[in-house]
């Protein structure tokens, strides 16, 4: 059987969802002594980068620039090592946003609701579009579908402090292609007292693992040829 | 925190033998990086004399033929630059320095070489 | 071997000015380029890598860009601690070659 290199881990530097004409940025990470990276996109050649000394990093990145509905699709990449090609990676979905319309999102019964009611957000938009998504600030990749004509709802069932935070739709075109996103929407979860004084309100930070971690090579690392990783897949 | 150090002899006759070592502390010298001679002639003009690499695979500046060696010994954590033929073109300050970017790379102080007749 | 072609050779600047550097290589290194500063009686130090791509510690003020054969080096307001020697370095092709420097005096 043919010898292959373990498989790279393919992500997307601070987001998936590129707003259109601005630049995506992919980073694959591979092992350190790759002398060649290959970026695939809808399974054919689209980039290769070399690192050269004294670079020596654990991969590259790929810049993507003036971003569009042609260049949304599924990445994945591959490295070499001398001779030896690595498997292919888990495949990347990258959206792009901020195409024809922006959607209106409402939620009922309103934004402040207490612990235990029920809760649905309706996302509208008037152009033609059947599937809309919901995402919470910093949960983007737990995206929730819902289908209609001009208008979606997404029941949220009965809500906990836990769903505290602020919300955005988009109408999808495609898969790959999005509208603008509504205004968001804060939803404030009020408890009893005493859940409320321990509840945080959910960070807006950006998803942690969205970022580009290429780093120096160290002799431990060098044993550790890739960090364990358990592959996410945003559309599957 | 990795330091550098160059030791040899501050004057070599020319025809004879140049060699030099680098001292590497905190760091070990196999773990990666790209360890590197680099000289500055008088008036600052600096020249990439070549490297020894984590690995041990050799890059050496075409300019010094087949004059240069550098060698390591991994038990001492310690490379050597040796430069053969030496004339008074090879007058310098010769420096050992890690590079390996994105990291912050690390150099020795120096150590100034005189070739004379 | 790549020729890299530095300029100015020397400046004087004023506090907070900006001041810009430029290094042009006799072909095109692909963004394989380096930006050292060696301040008197020191160590050369790398301050960006590919061109543009700031090292760990470096501070903000410095930045690099350019693509091809022609690259430069800005400090967006000059410090006085920024006096010294500037060099570029290309890497795309052995052997490594530095440009001739710039001098950086305030005035």
């Known amino acids: 059987p043919k010898q292959t290199l373990p498989k790279p881990i393919i992500r997307a530097e601070s987001t998936y969802m590129v707003p259109k004409e601005k630049q995506a940025t992919l980073c694959c990470q591979g092992s350190y002594g790759a002398v060649e990276y290959q970026l695939h996109f809808e399974g054919s050649l689209f980039a290769v980068e070399r690192p050269k000394p004294p670079e020596r990093i654990n991969g590259v990145k790929f810049h993507i620039p003036d971003m569009n509905s042609r260049k949304a699709g599924r990445y994945s990449c591959i490295y070499r090592v001398g001779e030896l090609w690595s498997e292919r990676s888990d495949l990347l979905d990258l959206v792009v946003t901020e195409m024809y319309d922006t959607p209106t999102l409402s939620v009922h019964p309103g934004p402040e609701v207490t612990s235990g009611e029920k809760v649905t957000f309706y996302c509208r938009l008037d152009t033609a579009t059947s599937m809309f998504l919901l995402l919470k600030e910093g949960r983007s990749r737990d995206v929730q579908r819902s289908y209609g004509k001009v208008q979606a709802e997404f029941p949220m069932g009965p809500v906990t402090t836990a769903h505290r935070g602020s919300y955005r739709c988009f109408g999808s075109y495609n898969n790959y292609a999005w509208s603008f996103p509504s205004e968001p929407v804060k939803l404030l979860v009020t408890g009893d007292i005493e859940n409320t004084s321990l509840a945080p309100t959910d960070p807006t930070f950006p998803d942690s693992w969205d970022t580009c971690l290429l780093t120096r090579e160290t002799g431990l690392q060098k044993d550790l040829a890739l960090w364990d990783h358990t592959a996410q897949n945003l559309l599957r | 925190d990795v330091q550098l150090q160059e030791s040899g002899p501050g004057l070599v006759k020319t025809s004879q033998s140049l060699s030099l070592t680098c001292s590497v502390t905190?760091?070990?010298?196999?773990?990666?990086?790209?360890w590197n001679w680099i000289r500055q002639f008088p008036g600052n003009k600096l020249e990439w004399v070549g490297y020894?690499?984590?690995?041990?695979?050799?890059n050496y500046n075409p300019s010094l033929k087949n004059r240069i060696s550098i060698t390591r010994d991994t038990s001492k954590n310690q490379f050597f630059l040796k430069l053969n033929s030496v004339t008074t073109e090879d007058t310098a300050t010769y420096y050992c320095a890690r590079l390996g970017y994105p990291a912050m790379d690390s150099w020795g102080q120096g150590t100034s070489v005189t070739v004379s007749s | 071997d790549i020729k890299m072609t530095q300029s100015p050779s020397s400046m004087y600047a004023s506090l907070g000015e900006r001041v810009t550097i430029t290094c042009k290589a006799s072909?095109?290194?692909?963004?394989?380029l380096s930006w050292f500063q060696q301040k008197p009686g020191k160590s050369p130090k790398t301050l960006i890598y590919?061109?543009?791509r700031l090292v760990d510690g470096v501070p903000s003020r410095f930045s690099g860009s350019g693509s091809g054969q022609d690259y430069s080096l800005t400090i967006s307001s000059l410090e006085f601690e920024d006096l010294g020697i500037y060099y570029c370095l290309q890497y795309d092709e052995f052997p490594w070659t530095f440009g001739g420097g710039t001098k950086l005096e305030i005035k």
């Open positions: 020894i690499s984590y690995d041990g695979s050799n």
């Open positions: 905190g760091y070990s010298i196999t773990s990666d990086d790209y």
């Open positions: 590919r061109a543009n």
């Open positions: 072909q095109d290194i692909n963004s394989y």
